[in-house]
């Protein structure tokens, strides 16, 4: 039975040209995290594998930095980066957990972080 929950940074906003940390946290389970995939719609940004390290998609290699932890840092933001991001946690023995983050990239300097929320 899958008992865990994914906590994410929720709805977040950031300034054009700036950077943002995409972060998810798996809690309420003792399952072992074997891999985390970071995806934007149907595009792979990066994979963090517990044994192998990081695989950064070449399309994003100049703008994506691994970490902190299992998170992902997105740099040199453009308005085209606005949208949904997913952290997909592969765990043993539970299976797969998915968290969602919505990022809005703003032209102005009034970007603020949204509240944290949980996805069961």
């Amino acid at each position: 039975m899958m008992t865990g929950t994914i906590e994410t940074t929720g709805n977040i906003s950031a300034e054009k040209g700036g950077s943002i940390i995409l972060q998810c946290h798996l809690s309420s389970t003792t399952a072992q995290v074997t891999q985390v995939n970071w995806e934007q719609q149907d595009q792979l940004l990066a994979i963090c594998n517990a044994d192998l390290g990081w695989h950064i998609s070449p399309s994003f290699k100049d703008r994506v930095a691994p970490g902190p932890g299992l998170g992902l840092t997105l740099q040199s933001l453009t308005v085209n980066d606005t949208g949904e991001y997913f952290c997909i946690y592969h765990t043993y023995p539970d299976g797969t957990y998915t968290g969602r983050i919505f990022l809005e990239v703003l032209e102005s300097s009034v970007a603020e972080h949204g509240a944290r929320f949980q996805i069961p």
């Epitope: 995939n37 192998l52 950064i56 592969h90």
Partner: antibody
Framework: QVQLQESGPGLVNPSQTLSLTCIVS??????????WSWIRQHPGKGLEWIGY???????YYNPSLKSRVTISVDTTKNQFSLKLSSMTAADTAVYYC???????????????????WGQGPTVTVSS | EIVLTQTPLSLSVTPGQPASISCKSS???????????LSWYLQKPGLPPQVLIY???NRFSGVPDRFSGSGSGTDFTLKISRVEAEDVGVYYC?????????FGGGTKVEIK
């Protein structure tokens, strides 16, 4: 020498789920140097990559099939499996399993070529 | 996803003559680790594909030295220096630098 052998039905009814298994012999699926893939080939056509699994369970699926695909691994049986749901006539194809090499260095990893392939059963979707 | 375009679609070659197949990528396959993950496969009639070349130019174990690969960026080439009867089949290039893995459409090689 590592060999791969697919097993599963040759005929699947429309709307049903295809289940295929790839048995690995002559080596361990637990080797951290490889990823394990499924590829299909429609009659008279080219090759389409379905997805991969690592021995510890991490996967990535082709976005074109992601909503219907599940790849799993059973290290105790030295095998990995493909499930493809909601089958239609367009899913009629030869389904291959294959082993690919992983290059890992300095905290990063990369996917290299597919060096061992199964024989590939033809799966027909028909009622 | 990365699209690989192979030319020509088919090739009819006299035994002993050279053959060349092109594979062009929709985006640069420039590596981040110094290696370009572009490989070549031959699918003989009724058989699964078999790897010939990996990482652009490295011949796989047991592959005859008449097969060679070259290229960088977006343009890659497979050359057969002297075609033999056993070389007939469909040749595919594949990139694995970016997921999903993608294949070229294939080049069918026949003997004249």
């Amino acid at each position: 020498q590592v060999q791969l052998q697919e097993s599963g039905p040759g005929l699947v009814n429309p709307s049903q789920t295809l289940s295929l298994t790839c048995i690995v012999s002559g080596g361990s699926i637990r080797s951290g140097d490889y990823y394990w893939s499924w590829i299909r080939q429609h009659p008279g056509k080219g090759l389409e990559w379905i997805g991969y699994i690592y021995y510890s369970g991490g996967t990535y699926y082709n976005p074109s099939l992601k909503s219907r695909v599940t790849i799993s691994v059973d290290t105790t049986k030295n095998q990995f499996s493909l499930k493809l749901s909601s089958m239609t006539a367009a899913d009629t194809a030869v389904y291959y399993c294959a082993r690919g090499s992983i290059a890992a260095r300095s905290g990063y990893f990369y996917f290299s070529g597919l060096d061992v392939w199964g024989q590939g059963p033809t799966v027909t979707v028909s009622s | 996803e990365i699209v690989l375009t192979q030319t020509p679609l088919s090739l009819s070659v006299t035994p002993g003559q050279p053959a060349s197949i092109s594979c062009k990528s929709s985006q640069s396959l420039l590596p981040s680790d110094g290696k370009t993950y572009l490989s070549w496969y031959l699918q003989k009639p009724g058989l699964p594909p078999q790897v010939l070349i990996y990482e652009v130019s490295n011949r796989f174990s047991g592959v005859p030295d008449r097969f060679s690969g070259s290229g960088s960026g977006t343009d890659f080439t497979l050359k057969i220096s002297r075609v033999e009867a056993e070389d007939v089949g469909v040749y595919y290039c594949m990139q694995s630098i970016q997921l999903p893995l993608t294949f070229g459409g294939g080049t069918k090689v026949e003997i004249k």
